[in-house]
């Protein structure tokens, strides 16, 4: 677990859960509705989604030097997407099926974020945008875009944890 003082997370556990997240993100994506993306426009909800960038210390050298920078960035992203998946974008009409992978995806995001930040340790979280209610007609497109960017995010996170499990585990 990532705890104060920079000790290592449970890399193998994180690797397993992040791989599960990748699978869920891909299985959820086609189920949010068939979209004709000719109508795709800029949506404020998806403009500021977290991305893992070069300066975030998620490269092999950065992870060796101090994995905390990268892990904090991943944690911020997990919390961001967890909030989005709990918003009316996903809970409102059109209703998701009760057994939709989005529900499992949501729970797994929460699980990995808790694995990275146990109780009693508080990283500074990135400002979560206060989500104004989405109009029902916007939601299918918003879901599509959110899940597409989440796929990219968890793919990078999974690579980070795979590298950590292979080279940084005690």
């Amino acid at each position: 677990r990532a705890v104060p003082g920079g000790s290592s997370p449970a890399w193998t556990q994180c690797q397993q859960l992040s791989q599960k997240l990748c699978t869920l993100a891909w299985s959820a994506h086609p189920l949010v509705g068939h979209m004709d993306l000719r109508e795709e426009g800029d949506e404020e909800t998806t403009n500021d989604v977290p991305h893992i960038q070069c300066g975030d210390g998620c490269d092999p050298q950065g992870l060796r030097d101090n994995s905390q920078f990268c892990l904090q960035r991943i944690h911020q992203g997990l919390i961001f997407y967890e909030k989005l998946l709990g918003s009316d974008i996903f809970t409102g009409e059109p209703s998701l099926l009760p057994d939709s992978p989005v529900g499992q995806l949501h729970a797994s995001l929460l699980g990995l974020s808790q694995l990275l930040q146990p109780e009693g340790h508080h990283w500074e979280t990135q400002q979560i945008p206060s989500l104004s209610p989405s109009q029902p007609w916007q939601r299918l497109l918003l879901r599509f875009k959110i899940l597409r960017s989440l796929q990219a995010f968890v793919a990078v996170a999974a690579r980070v944890f795979a590298h950590g499990a292979a080279t940084l585990s005690p």
């Epitope: 993306l37 009316d88 009409e93 209703s95 029902p136």
Partner: antibody, heavy 115, light 113 residues
Framework: EVQLQQSGPELVKPGASVRMSCKAS????????IHWVKQKPGQGLEWIGY????????NYNENFKGKATLTSDKSSSTAYMELSSLTSEDSAVYYC????????WGQGTTLTVSS | DIVMSQSPSSLPVSVGEKVTMSCKSS????????????LAWSQQKPGQSPKLLIY???TRKSGVPDRFTGSGSGTDFTLTISSVKAEDLAVYYC?????????FGSGTKLEIK
């Protein structure tokens, strides 16, 4: 079986407040929004607003801002609506309902405002 | 706000008859990317709470008899009952969930002759 069970009838005096409840069962409470709808005697239906039980996010019809306050309690799978500064115009049956494409309605709570 | 207009307001019918009622919206309820119309029909029997019959303009809710059919797109919608039964005596409301605030039609009251 999905059910939305609403609290019983209320008789209150003008100027008072009232809180009614809507207890959900048979599904994951945080999966859908809970909408509230007003129906005055012999009249049609008017949407009040919704609450998202997952994060307590709300969205109100402008006509009910300042009149209705929506809250929820995840631990008991219950949504609440409080109506304040009551007048005879607030006498109506109030329904809670799940997402419109899921389509479950409570049985309604009758509110009578009278001195 | 989107205005929903229903006609007729009252509809006297005989048991076994086919009936249609109309619902018009002041703006389109069709989201073209998904080809979904954000319109529902509900039935309210005397002294009861409303009950969903049709959503997405034409999808019958599970358990609703197949004599109820929803059709239409954009701004013009129809609810058809192919062969009215005495138990269908009710007020039928259309309502839109395309944008907030959600709005309802004033209802069509089905009366048995």
């Amino acid at each position: 079986e999905v059910q939305l069970q609403q609290s019983g009838p209320e008789l209150v005096k003008p100027g008072a407040s009232v809180r009614m409840s809507c207890k959900a069962s048979g599904y994951t409470f945080t999966s859908y929004l809970i909408h509230w709808v007003k129906q005055k005697p012999g009249q049609g239906l008017e949407w009040i607003g919704y609450i998202n039980p997952y994060n307590d996010g709300t969205n109100y019809n402008e006509n009910f801002k300042g009149k209705a306050t929506l809250t929820s309690d995840k631990s008991s799978s219950t949504a609440y609506m409080e109506l304040s500064s009551l007048t005879s115009e607030d006498s109506a049956v109030y329904y809670c309902a799940s997402n419109w494409d899921v389509g479950y309605w409570g049985q309604g709570t009758t509110l009578t405002v009278s001195s | 706000d989107i205005v929903m207009s229903q006609s007729p307001s009252s509809l006297p019918v005989s048991v076994g008859e086919k009936v249609t009622m109309s619902c018009k919206s002041s703006q389109s309820l069709l989201y073209s990317s998904s080809q979904k119309n954000y319109l529902a029909w509900s039935q309210q029997k005397p002294g009861q709470s409303p009950k969903l019959l049709i959503y997405w303009a034409s999808t019958r809710k599970s358990g609703v008899p197949d004599r109820f059919t929803g059709s239409g797109s954009g701004t013009d919608f129809t609810l058809t009952i192919s062969s009215v039964k005495a138990e269908d005596l009710a007020v039928y409301y259309c309502h839109q969930y395309y944008s907030y605030p959600f709005t309802f039609g004033s209802g069509t009251k089905l009366e048995i002759k």
